[in-house]
Amino acid sequence: RTTTCFGDGCQNTASRCKNGGTWDGLKCQCPNLYYGELCEEVVSSIDIGPPETISAQMELTVTVTSVKFTEELKNHSSQEFQEFKQTFTEQMNIVYSGIPEYVGVNITKLRLGSVVVEHDVLLRTKYTPEYKTVLDNATEVVKEKITKVTTQQIMINDICSDMMCFNTTGTQVQNITVTQYDPEEDCRKMAKEYGDYFVVEYRDQKPYCISPCEPGFSVSKNCNLGKCQMSLSGPQCLCVTTETHWYSGETCNQGTQKSLVYGHHHHHH
């Protein structure tokens, strides 16, 4: 956030940029957390926009019995590997076709034992606060589907009638990795020393990292005619003085008419 300065006071302003702000010849360039002419004000909202999608990766091993292993399958650029990859991908696309989160498979290694296929099943979902549950459910369905297909599509009399056949006992799930996204943690980190006062609130399933000085949220502090300002001790209302009133109180809700005070003082003296 930047504030431009014109005139004689500018050089003076340059040495007074606060909170890590830097002078660029015209204005104080403020770090993310601050704004104002001298970077003296703390922002009331921080952009922690979530990623559009969250991914998960399942490390699986299956044993394909309908292809005889050859050394060429170890070479990822060989004709044999490329063809195996194409057929395996097509088969897995059929297996997982009912899973909306399914993106595809990635073969990491082929090794001897019929053909042992070490691969990743890739899952993706749109970000919502429930993304963990969505991906956990998807990984369970993947396990169910791969277990089912490797039990059903088996060699009979040393021949396969399906696109691919499997060894029922060769199916293993090694590891499941879900991209971590924790808006509360991100919010705390980005708010730095003000982390205790910033909270995450959701609107249309999107997280907003806000302090009570940001209006329009359930935690928003109502300063009435005053101005909410963040300090290291938390949000505070700076009350205003108008031509006719002084305002005071924690939320600037107590107005005192100047004329009454002056009248009283005048009368007193």
């Epitope: 309908s66 060429e72 063809e83 040393d158 009638s161 399906d162 696109m163 056949c165």
Partner: nanobody
């Protein structure tokens, strides 16, 4: 890429013989799988026989065992199907298929490379 060219089809009386050929090109290895499939009108494509070109395996459908013989000439990269004691139910379009893998599946979806068909008609 792998290319297949099938030939040798024709019309024959029941009990007669035919020999189908399928020339292959584009392989980087001399060890792969080749197969003959057939498709009669209104029916699904079915396997007739397959062979590994290293001689490691041959397979025949029950309906053709003892009458049809699959073979491969490595020097010519050509697949053959010797068809003897032909029956009217052998009438179909015959296709050769190939894979760079040593396949043990009779499902046509597992075979990526296909030649154009050659018609075999057996009349009684």
């Amino acid at each position: 890429d792998v290319q297949l060219q099938a030939s040798g089809g024709g019309s024959v009386q029941a009990g007669g013989s035919l020999r189908l050929s399928c020339a292959a090109s584009g392989y980087t290895s001399n060890r792969y799988s080749m197969a003959w499939f057939r498709q009669a009108p209104g029916k699904e494509r079915e396997v007739v026989a397959f062979i590994w070109t290293d001689g490691g395996r041959t397979y025949y459908a029950d309906s053709v065992k003892g009458r049809l013989t699959i073979s491969h000439d490595n020097a010519k990269n050509t697949l053959y199907l010797q068809m003897d004691s032909l029956k009217p139910e052998d009438t179909a379009m015959y296709y050769c298929a190939a894979s760079s893998l040593l396949l043990q599946t009779i499902n046509p979806r597992a075979w990526p490379y296909w030649g154009q068909g050659t018609q075999v008609t057996v009349s009684s």
